[in-house]
């Protein structure tokens, strides 16, 4: 028989606890691992056709 | 330059086991995530394992649980799928992937950037 | 486990069309949901992640939307190369599930 739906913490997951600088708490894995930056660009000049996507910075490797 | 290579794939008959590999290179595999995703013939994309090597942990899609198993040596920055009890319904293409992360609000928002090119693996009798 | 259902399953369209296709979870999860591109004999690209942010060197023509439970990818004018299978994911809670896919033909 299959389970009932799982809570959205996931598997037995524990609350998210704070990271070193570096890194962010992956809600997927339960643990704190790598992560870049989001960078969100400046918004384009008024008149323009649409917004700019928002980007990011890669992780550092 | 981030790459996954992987390597094991073949024909298997039913109840029979391999072993896939999955080489990194360009990052260390043990900051982030690695999952194995495969694709059945004409079918679509299905999850089978992650493993973060950095902490040994890992879960698995019921479908393989108890018959595969995640492991990573973060010596060699390889992470691999031992697979046993093979059935007809594994046959597939099985990626490697990285789960790529960035902070929003100390919180993790990512996907899988980098996946390997495929490895196939056959169960026939 | 989260299921992910995608719409349509396939559409034909013509070079300079924009194009949408939907996502639906069955439960919240949040803004945490990807878009990939796959083309056959090849691994999937991410497009985009977290619903709406263009992973790095993605042409701006795709963009994302959405959160809780109804997502949106979005190609503003479909490209030659853009012909392919669009997934969308959800990464919310283990196990991280994928659509069942969408095909964009060539109209």
């Known amino acids: 028989m299959r389970r009932g739906p799982r809570s959205l913490r996931g598997r037995d997951a524990p609350a998210p606890t704070p990271c070193v600088p570096a890194e962010c708490f992956d809600l997927l894995v339960r643990h704190c691992v790598a992560c870049g930056l989001l960078r969100t660009p400046r918004p384009k000049p008024a008149g323009a056709s649409s917004p700019a996507p928002r980007t990011a910075l890669q992780p550092q490797e | 330059e981030v790459q996954l290579v992987e390597s094991g794939g073949g024909l298997v008959q039913p109840g029979g086991s391999l072993r896939l590999s999955c080489a990194a290179s360009?990052?260390?595999?043990?900051?982030?995530?690695i999952h194995w995703v495969r694709q059945a013939p004409g079918k679509g994309l299905e999850w089978v394992a992650w493993i973060t090597p950095g902490h040994g942990s890992t879960d698995y899609a019921d479908s393989v649980k108890g018959r595969f198993t995640i492991s990573a040596d973060t010596s060699k920055n390889t992470a691999y799928l031992q697979m046993n009890s093979l059935r007809a319904e594994d046959t597939a293409v099985y990626y490697c992937?990285?789960?790529?992360?960035?902070?929003?609000?100390?919180?993790?928002?990512?996907?899988?950037?980098?996946w390997g090119q495929g490895t196939l693996v056959t169960v026939s009798s | 486990d989260i299921q992910m259902t995608q719409s349509p399953s396939s559409l034909s369209a013509s070079v300079g069309d924009r194009v949408t296709i939907t996502c639906r979870a069955s439960q919240d999860v949040s803004t945490a949901v990807a878009w990939y591109q796959q083309k056959p004999g090849k691994a999937p690209k991410l497009l985009i992640y977290?619903?709406?942010f263009l992973y790095s060197g993605v042409p701006s023509r795709f963009s994302g939307s959405g959160s809780g439970t109804d997502f949106t990818l979005t190609i503003s004018s479909l490209q030659p190369e853009d012909f392919a299978t669009y997934y969308c994911q959800q990464s919310r809670i283990t196990p991280p599930t994928f659509g069942q896919g969408t095909k964009v033909e060539i109209k």
């Open positions: 977290s619903a709406s």
């Open positions: 992937a990285r789960r790529v992360c960035y902070n929003r609000l100390g919180v993790c928002a990512g996907g899988m950037d980098y």
């Open positions: 360009g990052f260390t595999i043990s900051s982030s995530s």
